[in-house]
């Protein structure tokens, strides 16, 4: 028998520095977690103690903090090189700055293979990107060889900016021939490493003949056997065992997100490459693990540029950006409109001639808007200003919801109106009329939504049975501010870009902004 240790991360999302327990900015260092310096300490400890170790990343290193905004992926290559990752799969967020924003900072600089078997380049890009990412890589590990095949969510064109010269194929269809090829070349231990979410990970384990282990990402899935060490609630045991169609037991793992945990899986193979046993657990990277001093020093060196960036002007406003709780928790506020407009703008993807865009709607809890911005400071808007408006380090995500769920959400928005509570929704691509004289749960008297399958966008009444795409904060997607119906009834959830980054990019693009209050949210009384 031969034992392999798989160390794995996924959805790190730019958390190079240690964070608080909820993966936001570290405040009290003695209670902070994660970060590449602490990760390196643990990885090195395991490498020294065990003979056959692979360190793998299942994608979405890009996007999430000011580190990515400033360094644009160079930080990912640099610190992953320093940690000596063995392989990485491409995630959807690796395309956030377009293909060039992937090629130059990461693909050309990484000293480890970057993988995806289901992304095929065409046209002029094919020769430019040739060899920069691979469908698989065969790695020598101890006295054996291990094949690693990569995959990426086929929804990436709707979630990011891969352009028109990359085709995202069905994961299972693309993986099978690559695995078959490795088998014919006597590679009998194969790991599928990828970024399509836990449901697809399980399908790959079930359907792709010859895959021995699946290491996934995208869905931020936390798996754990025994008593979990922090706040995350396990979605199942670690590893999660799938019985494949050909009768094998295939371990599937994921390690939550944000570098809070290091996935740790031990696999025992027989001489024919069959998995005999698998066990392990994610390791919580808490403050009991010291940060490696050399990596920490490097982080501090790279940090300097971030501090300078946060005070630079992104653009100007010529109007007061009303982000006060007195406005945003009671009525339409122009800060809410600005943020929602930025959220939609960030999700412009012309992937189908029938649709002007795949999504037109935004909702945003008023309680998430934490500060106004005064235009009388020469109109200057900085990252620092935006960090005061959106201080929680969240993301603006894409969900699919039925109209009936949206209607419930808008009822919830005003179910206790007048108490300055955070659930009052700011909107984009939606016209809502409330009648507060009616009883809670029956106050939405008009709800019109902007069409997507149209050449001239216009507002049509919400249909209860129709499925709609909506951009919203991850806080709402996770049921925050009492929006349990969103969490319980959403049909799909894909994590998006860092909230401040979305708004800062929009302001930089527009240069001068002047958002108005324009009748997106109205109140009526009596019959409507």
């Amino acid at each position: 028998a031969w034992e392999l240790t798989i160390l794995h991360t996924n959805d790190v999302h730019s958390r190079l520095e240690q964070t608080s327990e909820d993966s936001s900015k570290c405040v009290n260092a003695s209670r902070c977690m994660g970060g590449v310096a602490r990760l390196f300490t643990k990885v090195q400890q395991i490498r020294r103690a065990e003979p056959n170790v692979l360190l793998l990343d299942a994608g979405d290193q890009y996007q999430g903090t000011i580190w990515f905004t400033v360094y644009k992926g160079a930080e990912v290559a640099h610190f992953m090189n320093a940690l000596r990752y063995d392989a990485m799969a491409l995630g959807n967020h690796e395309f956030d700055n377009g293909v060039e924003g992937l090629i130059e900072p990461l693909l050309k600089e990484a000293k480890f293979p970057i993988l995806s078997a289901n992304i095929k380049a065409k046209g002029p890009l094919a020769s430019q990107i040739s060899g920069l990412y691979l469908p698989y890589k065969v790695l020598p590990v101890g006295d054996e060889v291990v094949g690693i095949v990569g995959y990426t969510s086929k929804e990436t064109p709707f979630l990011s900016n891969p352009g028109t010269n990359l085709v995202f194929e069905d994961e299972i269809t693309a993986l099978q021939p690559e695995v078959d090829k490795l088998k014919t070349l006597n590679v009998n231990k194969i790991i599928a490493l990828g970024h399509s979410g836990f449901e697809m990970d399980k399908l790959i384990a079930q359907k792709v003949r010859g895959v021995d282990v699946v290491v996934g990402g995208h869905s931020n899935t936390f798996l754990y056997t025994g008593n979990p060490p922090s706040k995350e609630v396990p979605a199942g045991k670690y590893p999660f065992i799938v019985t494949s169609d050909d009768g094998r037991k295939v371990p599937v793992v994921q390690a939550y997100a944000f570098g809070k945990y290091l996935g740790y899986l031990k696999i025992e193979f027989d001489e024919r490459g069959n998995v005999i046993s698998s066990h392990g657990n994610p390791i919580l990277l808490n403050s009991s693990i010291p940060e490696d001093p050399s990596i920490k020093a490097d982080i501090n060196k790279w940090r300097i540029k971030l501090d300078n960036y946060s005070t630079q002007e992104l653009g100007k406003t010529i109007v007061y950006l009303d982000g006060s709780s007195q406005s945003c928790r009671f009525r339409e506020c122009n800060m809410g409109n600005l943020i929602c407009d930025a959220m939609i703008n960030n999700n412009l993807r012309h992937t189908d001639e029938m649709f002007w865009n795949h999504v037109s709607m935004c909702i945003l809890n008023g309680g998430g808007i934490r500060s106004p911005i005064d235009e009388r400071n020469n109109g200057t808007i900085t990252w620092e200003n935006l960090a005061a408006v959106l201080p929680f380090g969240g993301t603006f995500d894409l969900v699919q919801l039925k109209g009936s769920t949206l209607k419930k959400a808008f009822e919830h928005s005003v179910h206790r109106y007048g108490q300055s509570t955070g659930e009052f929704l700011q909107v984009g691509g939606i016209h809502v009329v409330y009648d507060l004289s009616r009883k809670p749960g029956d106050r939405v008297v008009k709800l019109d939504v902007l069409c997507t399958k149209c050449r001239v966008p216009s507002y049509d009444p919400l249909k209860m049975d129709e499925v709609y795409k909506v951009i919203l904060p991850n806080f709402l997607a996770n049921g925050g501010d009492g929006f349990q119906m969103i969490k319980d009834e959403l049909l799909r959830h894909d994590s998006g870009d860092q909230d401040i980054n979305v708004v800062s990019t929009y302001i930089s693009k527009m240069k001068v902004i002047y958002p108005a209050v324009e009748g997106r949210i109205k109140f009526s009384t009596g019959s409507h």
Epitope: R47, P51, R84, K111, G131, L132, V145
Partner: antibody
């Protein structure tokens, strides 16, 4: 600057063994795999195998399996290749080569000539 | 094992000429191909890896291209120091295998 310095030329009789050393400097020895390649007189290059100096793991070309042993001594940053049951057609220059992150052979030793003759 | 076939096995060219050497793999090698230059009595020297990535310090007149099974090494303007034997090598799978070499001689 990366340097790989191999041991001197050897003359061996058929059936004997030879052990060639390769001393590395200018980089962290345990960070890169070491490959061994040979070249018979007037011929092309032939890959023999690979050792991971970090854990001593080896991958051998089946053609040499049972005859070749690759080892390392991390205390002196040196890799070794031993070939046993020598035959006349093992006469060749034997090279060690450090592989880069992608496993291409980045830096090569100067070569050790091994002559097998009765 | 994957068989690497180089062509031509030798060629004569003049300084300033554009020279192209091809290498064909017996099956798709996933761009895991390197090119080496070897001068008489010397060890090989890595020029290109991952089919098209030039090693630091190697002159830009050398370039690599290709994917799948067919690969090319091009010297855009041959210089006197380029007369040598060139080898391709696949490192996609084990065992690593080399082409038989292409000797570039002075015309």
């Amino acid at each position: 600057e990366v340097q790989l310095v191999e041991s001197g030329a050897e003359v061996k009789k058929p059936g004997a063994s030879v052990k060639v050393s390769c001393k590395a400097s200018g980089y962290t020895f345990t960070d890169s795999n070491m490959d061994w390649v040979r070249q018979a007189p007037g011929q092309g290059l032939e890959w023999m195998g690979d050792i991971n100096p970090n854990n001593g793991g080896t991958i051998y070309n089946q053609k040499f399996k049972g005859r070749v042993t690759m080892t390392r001594d991390t205390s002196i940053n040196t890799a070794y290749m031993e070939l046993s049951r020598l035959r006349s057609d093992d006469t060749a220059v034997y090279y060690c080569a450090m592989t880069n992150w992608d496993y291409a052979m980045d830096y090569w030793g100067q070569g050790t000539t091994v002559t097998v003759s009765s | 094992d994957i068989v690497m076939t180089q062509s031509p096995s030798s060629l004569s060219a003049s300084v300033g000429d554009r020279v192209t050497i091809t290498c064909k793999a017996s099956q798709d090698i996933n761009s895991q191909l390197s090119w080496y230059q070897q001068k008489p009595g010397k060890a090989p020297k890595l020029l290109i890896y991952r089919a098209n990535r030039l090693i630091d310090g190697v002159p830009s007149r050398f370039s690599g291209s290709g994917s799948g099974t067919d690969f090319t090494l091009t010297i855009s303007s041959l210089q006197p120091e380029d007369f040598a034997t060139y080898y391709c090598q696949q490192y996609d799978v084990f065992p690593r295998t080399f082409g038989q070499g292409t000797k570039v001689e002075i015309k």
